[in-house]
Amino acid sequence: AFGISGVQKYTRALHDSSITGISPITEYLASLSTYNDQSITFALEDESYEIYVEDLKKDEKKDKVLLSYYESQHPSNESGDGVDGKMLMVTLSPTKDFWLHANNKEHSVELHKCEKPLPDQAFFVLHNMHSNCVSFECKTDPGVFIGVKDNHLALIKVDSSENLCTENILFKLSET
């Protein structure tokens, strides 16, 4: 991990950063949980998906999310976050044709059905943080991360180096 000035340098060019190719370089099917081991779940309600952050019962099955990894032409200055020196971006899809989107106006994270090529709002810069955690920074709004607020996912502005490692923007990925 690195300080906020590093984040700002790292993300300054994000608005102009284009994805290298329209195809992901690899994908990974994983369950997504918070730093405090709450599960991110997805529920179909009234023909749209809602996203929840909740404690699951002991034997309750975790929802899976497909992480699609893309190379950006913007160089990475973090060790372990890029491939061949290029920054990694991800899209997150819990079911076919639906992707997490950053709604910067509402500071919310939403699920939208859409076709490829995906809009910029569906792309997040992947940061590998401490303790095998990751964080997701909006491509469309550098310095803004997916985080947890009131048992929902929300967009959280990170404006100091202490906040960069705050628990509410850290997530764990696991196969189980």
């Epitope: 329209i22 195809s23 992901p24 370089i25 690899t26 990974y28 990694l88 590998n128 196969e175």
Partner: antibody, heavy 128, light 108 residues
Framework: QVQLQESGPGLVKPSETLSLTCTVS??????????WGWIRQPPGKGLEWIGS???????YYNPSLKSRVTISVDTSKNQFSLMLTSVTAADTAVYYC????????????????????WGNGTTVTVSS | EIVLTQSPGTLSLSPGERATLSCRAS???????LAWYQQKPGQAPRLLIY???SRATGIPDRFSGSGSGTDFTLTISRLEPEDFAVYYC?????????FGGGTKVEIK
């Protein structure tokens, strides 16, 4: 820059088990977002995918070889391995290990792979 | 499984010429998950193109890929001496992944 190197016996007797190891250098298997796999090429012929593995140990095999193949990973040694049982002369080939991108098909609920970094290959002959 | 047919089997061209290699799939796939590899004698294959049109790291821009559905093309705009080799296409839309039989590009 990630590099891969295959090792193992070059000669295996029919009905025995072929065992190969791939050592990864220049990067950690555990921290990689990629998968790892084995491909083979019989003399003068085309390429055949054998199987792939993620660092967690989750495996994906070619159905035509599945009953005879085991792929395993040892993250502490930064290695992954291939075992092919009950070999015949038809298993004579150059065996390559490779790093792989894995892509998911929602309809089939299955992963498939392309290989972006390859080892140099090792020739395995099945003969008595 | 998806069968990939490459044509022509052999392409005889001179350095500086344009090479057009074809790969046809037995079934259509919507993802454009098709890769191209180059293999020289005694060497491992090298990834050139993934996702039908995305160049792999370090691949010169004289190599380009195109196509969708069942028909895909690898184009080498101006052949360099080091480009004479065998080229394989490979689909990774569906498991098991499959390779084409290869096209040999030889010096005329």
């Amino acid at each position: 820059q990630v590099q891969l190197q295959e090792s193992g016996p070059g000669l295996v007797k029919p009905s025995e088990t072929l065992s190969l190891t791939c050592t990864v250098s220049g990067g950690s298997i555990r921290s990689s977002i990629f998968y790892w796999g084995w491909i083979r090429q019989p003399p003068g012929k085309g390429l055949e995918w054998i199987g792939s593995i993620y660092y967690s140990g989750r495996t994906y095999y070619n159905p035509s070889l599945k009953s005879r193949v085991t792929i395993s990973v040892d993250t502490s040694k930064n290695q992954f391995s291939l075992m092919l049982t009950s070999v015949t002369a038809a298993d004579t080939a150059v065996y390559y290990c490779a790093r792989a991108g894995g892509l998911y098909n929602w309809n089939d609920e299955s992963f498939s792979f392309y290989m972006d970094v390859w080892g140099n290959g090792t020739t395995v002959t099945v003969s008595s | 499984e998806i069968v990939l047919t490459q044509s022509p089997g052999t392409l005889s061209l001179s350095p500086g010429e344009r090479a057009t290699l074809s790969c046809r799939a037995s079934q259509s796939f919507s993802s454009s998950y098709l890769a191209w590899y180059q293999q020289k004698p005694g060497q491992a294959p090298r990834l050139l193109i993934y996702g039908a049109s995305s160049r792999a790291t370090g691949i010169p821009d004289r190599f380009s890929g195109s196509g969708s559905g069942t028909d895909f093309t690898l184009t080498i705009s101006r052949l360099e001496p080091e480009d004479f080799a065998v080229y394989y296409c490979q689909q990774y839309d569906r498991s098991p992944l499959t390779f084409g039989g290869g096209t040999k590009v030889e010096i005329k």
